[in-house]
Interface confidence: medium
């Protein structure tokens, strides 16, 4: 069947429609176009002939139109009047006629819209405000944006005039915002520029800052006023009623008690013309005393030691409060204050007491602080630490050992070789090493002040060879699926390279082994049953090498499902009951028993003789590993027949 | 093959001094610290010291101080012991012996090298 | 200076048997993972003869029937099965320190 399909259906004034033909019959002579829903030779607009390909303008010719031999029309520089049906007249090689009717839109393209205001400057819960989108266009549909967001749902917002029109009754503050207006037609849509809606609105009731009320004399009084308005307020101070600026801060430096009294802030809007004022009551107190720390032992001996703080002067019924690290006091045993909380004890003080300390008088209106106090704690020495690490050394490179302990006042070091005093330095130093240089190095760290000494040892080998290995492990007995080890080839000496071995091969290549500390150090993660097995590190040099004795990993696992033996679900009455528990376990797991879920003996092994038919139920294997603190089990059912009422039965154990 | 060639027996009148010596073959002794040893009849062992060779430097055990004095000639491969102010509490077998020759050792007093010994006799 | 203090002064233990001599530092002897203990064997007329150093390690060329064992200021030499030829006098020696020797421990076999 002949249709005639209009793209696009709506069209943009001054744009373009293509009026499609489909199923054009074959055999045709020509066919010409009408506007309408009908054939009329007045509302002709192009007539075309096949045979001579002649197209040939009619009375509704426009001069936009343009004929295609396959029929379709195409129509220009669209205008409103186009709007309607057209119909195609086609008439075939035998002179039959066929027609069809399609039609289109014409819309025209939306101007940019614009939003009128009929109150420039509403004042908050007084004005209502109505926004109009101009112009007003046929056809159009008009929408609302707040802040780049649809319309809220509210009762003081209104649609009018076909949505051309937003009323906001009752302005408030919070009205303040962005409007937009938009219209739509089927072929366009254009957006306005935002009107910011400027809500007048307050004063609201000022704020005074600091809220503080109480002051020293010899202070400054900086009081801040603040308060909501649109446009802002212009500010007023009065003291004790007495007009005294208008300024939003009033100063008043080195105060005394005089100027205690009542202070009003008062804010007021020239547009909304209103006045709202505050009132705040300052008191100002003689001035109290600084308060100091004196201390009962200046350079306490840590763990040895008591200090004891007190803060000065003594007055009476005052409250004193102290500050560690400009924190509270922290709940703790070692602390102690007085009754009176005037002196502060430390019981057996520790390194990290060192502070600073500082005490306060609390008087009516503040607190007036001691400056700091820091403790100067006597330490140490802790245990030195030598560096770097290595134990082993070729000859003739330089040998140079390092000395640190933590200590207060810092440690005086001295070198010991083999129980010799060598010298009396952080640092020691020998060039051009041999292996008459091997031998136990004594750090030793002495505190002056404390008297303590401390001393590390530290075996140092020079030599060609290197020493045999052996591996350190940070878990011997690790819990399958949960742990890792970490292996480590000692000693750690220098320019050495470290391999390793697992059962006598290099290393597998797996996510689970990690290799660090320059290969000293093997990590397994994850650790499985498999990895039980034998780990061997070697270390090499340009001169040597050697390798470690085995070192096997003893993992921990299961216990796995327990397997109950024989299989026999069937037993003959009569019979023996002979059944054995076995689970993959390490170490070896305990057993024990259930029947019908009463326990029963704690054995690999249930033997009952001679069953019953009472004998019948549920037999239960618990498996229990103490190292992994994993349990398991399994329930097998076993029934007992009378003799020979059932073929292919067990005959028992 | 390492070893520590001693000087002979020694007969010395009380009062008097000794100096015996320590021959080493198979290795340099400017390589090692040299170490002497002293065993009095059916008694115990007591070190007296070491000397390093290369340097001369030398350790003593207290009690040996001023009593004994150790040298060495690396030309000749040779370490001596001289003991002074003889008395009957000298009299002893006096061993030289060195470490760690044919050990991974990490303590330079370890001694797997000993000479046979020489006897030291003090006479009134 | 560090005392060695070793027990018993003499020793008699049937052939084939287990002899074992301790030795008891006045201090610890052991540092940095090591423990500087060693063993010497002296038969009459005849110098020392290394048998166990660091404590625990065998010197190269001594029978495994000699072992020896501890740490810090408690040490063992342990001799099994006990051979005629390990008649002799057995010493400790220490070097954490100026060395010391033990007293010595005197072996006879039966």
């Known amino acids: 069947k002949l249709t005639i399909e209009s793209t696009p259906f709506n069209v943009a004034e001054g744009k373009e429609v293509l009026l499609l033909v489909h199923n054009l019959p074959q055999h045709l002579f020509g066919y010409s176009w009408y506007k309408g829903e009908r054939v009329d030779g007045n509302r002709q607009i192009i007539g075309y002939v096949i045979g001579t390909q002649q197209a040939t303008p009619g009375p509704a010719y426009s001069g936009r139109e343009i004929i295609y031999p396959n029929a379709s029309l195409l129509i220009q520089n669209i205008i409103q009047n186009d709007t309607g049906f057209y119909t195609l007249h086609v008439i075939k090689s035998d002179l039959v006629n066929e027609e069809a009717t399609g039609q289109f839109r014409v819309y025209p393209e939306l101007p940019k819209p614009s939003i009128s205001s009929n109150n420039s400057k509403p004042v908050e819960d007084k004005d209502a405000v109505a926004f109009t989108c101009e112009p007003e266009t046929q056809d159009a549909t008009y929408l609302w944006w707040v802040n780049n967001q649809s319309l809220p749902v509210s009762p003081r917002l209104q649609l009018s005039n076909g949505n051309r029109t937003l009323t906001l009754f009752n302005v408030t503050r919070n009205d303040t915002a962005s409007y937009k207006c938009e219209t739509q037609n089927p072929v366009s849509a254009r957006r306005s520029d935002s009107v910011i809606l400027n809500v007048l609105y307050g004063p609201d009731a000022p704020t005074i800052s600091p809220l503080n009320t109480s002051y020293r004399s010899g202070e400054n009084l900086n009081l801040s006023c603040h308060a909501a308005s649109n446009p802002p307020a212009q500010y007023s101070w009065f003291v004790n009623g007495t007009f005294q600026q208008s300024t939003q801060e009033l100063f008043i430096p080195n105060i005394t008690v005089n100027n205690s009294g009542s202070y009003t802030c008062q804010a007021h809007n020239s547009d909304t013309g209103l006045n709202r004022t505050t009132v705040t009551t300052i008191t100002v107190y003689a001035e109290p005393p600084k308060p100091f720390i004196t201390s009962n032992n200046s350079n306490p001996v840590e763990d040895e030691d008591a200090v004891a703080l007190t803060c000065e002067p003594e007055i009476q019924n005052t409250t004193y409060l102290w500050w560690v690290n400009n924190q509270s006091l922290p709940v703790s045993p070692r602390l102690q204050l007085s009754n009176d909380n005037r002196t502060l004890t430390l019981l057996s003080v520790t390194r990290n007491d060192v502070g600073p300390y500082e005490c306060g008088i609390q008087n009516e209106l503040s607190v007036d602080h001691s400056d700091p106090v820091i403790l100067n704690v006597l330490y140490g020495p802790d245990d030195p630490t030598i560096s770097p690490s290595y134990t082993y050394y070729r000859p003739g490179v330089n040998l140079s050992l390092s000395c640190h302990a933590a200590s207060n006042p810092p440690a005086q070091y001295s070198w010991l070789i083999d129980g010799n005093i060598q010298q009396h330095t952080q640092e020691l130093f020998i060039s051009n090493i041999t292996e008459k240089n091997s031998g136990l190095y004594t750090c030793q760290a002495n505190n002056s002040a404390s008297g303590h000494s401390r001393t590390t040892v530290k075996t140092i080998t020079v030599s060609a060879e290197l020493p045999k290995p052996s591996i350190s492990s940070n878990n011997s007995k690790p819990v399958e699926d949960k742990d890792a080890v970490a292996f480590t080839c000692e000693p750690e000496a220098q320019n050495t390279t470290y391999l390793w071995w697992v059962n006598g091969q290099s290393l597998p290549v797996s996510p689970r082994l990690q290799l660090s500390n320059g290969n000293r150090t093997l990590t397994l993660f994850n650790v499985t049953r498999n990895d039980a097995r034998a780990y061997v590190c070697g270390i090499q040099n340009s001169v040597s090498a050697n390798r470690s004795d085995p070192v096997t990993l003893d993992v921990l696992y299961g216990p796995d499902t327990p397997i109950i033996s024989p299989p026999d679900s069937s037993y003959l009455s009569g019979a023996n009951l002979n059944l054995s528990c076995h689970s993959a376990s390490n170490p070896s797991p305990q057993y024990s028993w259930r029947i019908n879920g009463i326990p029963q003996q704690h054995t690999q092994v249930l033997f009952i003789a001679k069953i019953t038919p009472n004998n019948n139920g549920t037999y239960a294997c618990f498996v229990s590993n103490l190292a992994t603190g994993r349990n398991n089990s399994i329930v097998k059912s076993i029934t007992v027949s009378a003799s020979g009422t059932s073929p292919g039965l067990s005959a028992g154990a | 093959e390492v070893q520590l060639q001693q000087s002979g027996a020694e007969l010395v009148r009380s009062g008097a001094s000794v100096k015996m010596s320590c021959t080493a073959s198979?290795?340099?002794?400017?390589?090692?610290?040299m170490h002497w040893v002293k065993q009095r009849p059916e008694q115990g062992l007591e070190w007296i010291g070491w000397?390093?060779?290369?340097?001369?430097?030398?350790e003593y055990a207290p009690k040996f101080q001023g009593k004994a004095t150790m040298t060495t000639d690396y030309s000749s491969n040779t370490a001596y012991l001289q003991l002074s102010s003889l008395t009957s509490e000298d009299t002893a077998v006096y061993y030289c012996?060195?470490?760690?020759?044919?050990?991974?050792?990490?303590?330079?007093?370890?001694?797997?090298?000993w000479g046979a010994g020489t006897t030291v006799a003090v006479s009134s | 200076d560090i005392v060695l203090t070793q027990s018993p002064a003499s020793l008699t233990v049937s052939l084939g048997l287990r002899a074992t001599i301790s030795c008891r530092a006045s201090k610890s002897v052991s540092a940095s993972g090591y423990s500087y203990m060693h063993w010497y064997q002296q038969r009459p007329g005849q110098p020392p003869k290394l048998l166990i150093y660091l404590a625990s390690n065998l010197q190269s060329g001594v029978p495994a029937r000699f072992s020896g064992s501890g740490s810090g200021t408690d040490f063992t030499l342990n001799i099994h099965p006990v051979e005629e030829e390990d008649a002799a006098t057995y010493y400790c020696?220490?070097?954490?320190?100026?060395?010391?020797f033990g007293g010595g421990t005197k072996l006879e076999i039966k």
């Open positions: 020696q220490h070097s954490r320190e100026l060395p010391t």
């Open positions: 198979g290795f340099n002794i400017k390589d090692y610290y």
């Open positions: 012996n060195t470490r760690g020759l044919s050990t991974m050792i990490t303590t330079r007093w370890f001694f797997d090298v």
């Open positions: 000397i390093d060779p290369e340097n001369g430097d030398t």
